[in-house]
Interface confidence: low
């Protein structure tokens, strides 16, 4: 019968002819009366056989990632009779892996959004690289992830590619970060190949800033002839947050005379000082009122940022009008 061994050829072999192994019948006594033949896809082109000895050679470079095995057929003939000595038999030559493929991130580009001020350990995104080498062949496709850019704000789990927050970030200081992740095969050992990917991490706003008045004192004037409901001027606060977190409401904190009111222009986020009661120069020619400003929406957990409302003082001068 046939004497079989397993046949392996390392991929990317640079030798012009690489000895793969030998076909042998146990009836072959070595007197050169047998002729071995190789049939099937790759016979005569990729693989050749020494017909006298049964030695098989690979005569071209093989790429395991293109083709990982070859199914060939073996024949052995007795030259003196021209008859087959053994039944034709199928056998396999496996192409063994070398580390010739770098890890690739196939889902690029990566982008993630995470709330500012998220605590350490918050999961941001998972990046995954794939390696075309053989996962069952040593460490050729065993990957380790590392952070090339993004410290100290981010970290990556070496075996999973999960990116987490490692330090709190303030959107008002920087609203996006580019993180560069490297995946190295051979679990990072020398001779490893690697690939890199970039992850754009954007910080979404949380309401961690209260509105603050631009001025601590506003001076306005009102004519004694002005009817009630007249807008006598505007005041303005600023808020470092964005969107609805920057929406604010103005109100009167102190007005003993109850002469004025403040309404909020939600388009411009300005406070409009309104005359609530008519004024009389001869009766009172100036007023002092205090206004305050607060965010429109404040989350319960974020109340710590909004304890003291910002206030401003408004001095209002009444202008005299000649009366008939």
């Amino acid at each position: 019968g046939w004497v079989w061994n397993q046949f392996f050829v390392p991929e990317e072999m640079n030798t012009t002819s690489h000895h793969v192994g030998r076909l042998r019948s146990d009836l072959d006594n070595g007197n050169n009366s047998f002729q071995y033949k190789l049939l099937g896809a790759g016979a005569g082109s990729t693989f050749i056989i020494d017909e006298r000895t049964g030695d098989i050679y690979a005569i071209e470079k093989l790429d395991r990632e293109e083709r990982s095995l070859y199914i060939l057929r073996a024949q052995v003939i007795d030259i003196t009779t021209g008859r087959a000595v053994e039944p034709e038999s199928e056998f396999v030559i496996k192409v063994s892996d070398i580390n010739d493929n770098e890890p690739k991130f196939l889902d690029e580009p990566y982008e993630a959004i995470v709330p500012e001020m998220s605590p350490e350990g918050t999961l941001v995104i998972q990046v995954t690289a794939s390696d075309a080498d053989d996962p069952s062949s040593g460490n050729n496709a065993r990957l380790l992830y590392s952070l090339l850019q993004g410290q100290p704000y981010f970290s990556v789990e070496p075996t999973t590619g999960v990116i987490r927050i490692s330090s709190k970030m303030d959107r008002e200081l920087q609203d996006e970060y580019w993180v560069i992740i490297q995946a190295k095969d051979m679990i990072g050992q020398p001779g490893a190949l690697s690939g890199t990917t970039s992850v754009l991490i954007k910080l979404s706003d949380v309401n961690d800033n209260k509105p603050i008045f631009k001025e601590s004192l506003y001076r306005l004037t009102v004519s004694e002839s002005a009817p009630t409901g007249t807008s006598i001027g505007t005041i303005m606060a600023y808020d470092n947050d964005i969107g609805e977190n920057a929406e604010m409401d103005y109100s009167i904190e102190e007005d003993d005379s109850q002469t004025f009111d403040i309404i909020t222009n939600h388009e411009t986020q300005e406070g409009i000082v309104i005359l609530k009661k008519k004024v009389n120069f001869e009766h009172q020619n100036h007023y002092g009122i205090r206004a305050k400003v607060k965010n429109h929406h404040v989350d319960e957990q974020l109340m710590k940022y909004h304890t003291e409302a910002s206030t401003t003082f408004i001095k209002i001068q009444v202008e005299d009008v000649d009366e008939p």
Epitope: N14, E102, L148, Q149, W178, I180, P190, G191, A192, L193, S194, G195, T196, S198
Partner: antibody, heavy 120, light 111 residues
Framework: QVQLVQSGAEVKKPGASVKVSCKAS????????MSWVRQAPGQGLEWMGI????????TYAQKFQGRVTMTGDTSTSTVYMELSSLRSEDTAVYYC?????????????WGQGTLVTVSS | QSVLTQPPSASGTPGQRVTISCSGS????????VNWYQQLPGTAPKLLIY???QRPSGVPDRFSGSKSGTSASLAISGLQSEDEADYYC???????????FGGGTKLTVLS
């Protein structure tokens, strides 16, 4: 065929800086590392550092740390090497050389070289 | 003083076989691929051998590379006058985290 075209020769005074450019074409610029190698007159090749144009991550030879800056512009497929605090011993031909997909893979294509002369 | 040691010069007559050695350490040749560059007078270096023994297309098979342990060598058989050039070995060094070149070998073809 891959092409790397470098900027022209420069003459600089000691203490000045020089910025050499290397424009790449006919390959995916962001997939390969780019190294800078210099050669002083009559001397051998000396590796200065490497940059990955897509992430901009760099590794510099210890000798040049603090004096060299390598940058890349993906919109023009160009890498730059700036060397500061020049001294006469920086007179050399500076080459850009395309690396592999990772640091330890060979440089397969080289620019034509840029002669930088440092003289007072 | 280069991290990789090459003989400063080598010579041979046309048709001869010449070998250029490159000696390093575990952190460079011992751990990584060796590459060889040819630099003809007045030109940029050209890749001759990569990953120890591979020839880029266009490089004649008279050039071959090998590596054993912490040493490597470049062999040129059937020497020709146009082979007169400087030859450099280069390898990535894991402990330096960077590339290192040999000092170069000037090959002279004697007529």
């Amino acid at each position: 065929q891959v092409q790397l075209v470098q900027s022209g020769a420069e003459v600089k005074k000691p203490g000045a800086s020089v910025k050499v450019s290397c424009k790449a074409s006919r390959y995916t610029f962001t997939s390969y590392y780019m190294s800078w190698v210099r050669q002083a007159p009559g001397q051998g090749l000396e590796w200065m550092g490497i940059i990955h144009p897509s992430g901009g991550d760099t590794t510099y030879a210890q000798k040049f740390q603090g004096r060299v800056t390598m940058t890349g512009d993906t919109s023009t497929s160009t890498v730059y090497m700036e060397l500061s605090s020049l001294r006469s011993e920086d007179t050399a031909v500076y080459y850009c050389a395309r690396g592999g997909i990772k640091l330890w893979l060979h440089f397969d294509y080289w620019g034509q070289g840029t002669l930088v002369t440092v003289s007072s | 003083q280069s991290v990789l040691t090459q003989p400063p010069s080598a010579s041979g007559t046309p048709g001869q076989r010449v070998t250029i050695s490159c000696s390093g350490s575990r952190s460079n040749i011992g751990s990584n691929f060796v590459n060889w560059y040819q630099q003809l007078p007045g030109t940029a270096p050209k890749l001759l051998i990569y990953t120890n023994n591979q020839r880029p297309s266009g490089v004649p098979d008279r050039f071959s590379g090998s590596k054993s342990g912490t040493s490597a060598s470049l062999a040129i058989s059937g020497l020709q006058s146009e082979d007169e050039a400087d030859y450099y070995c280069a390898v990535y060094d894991d402990s330096l985290n960077g590339w290192v070149f040999g000092g170069g070998t000037k090959l002279t073809v004697l007529s």
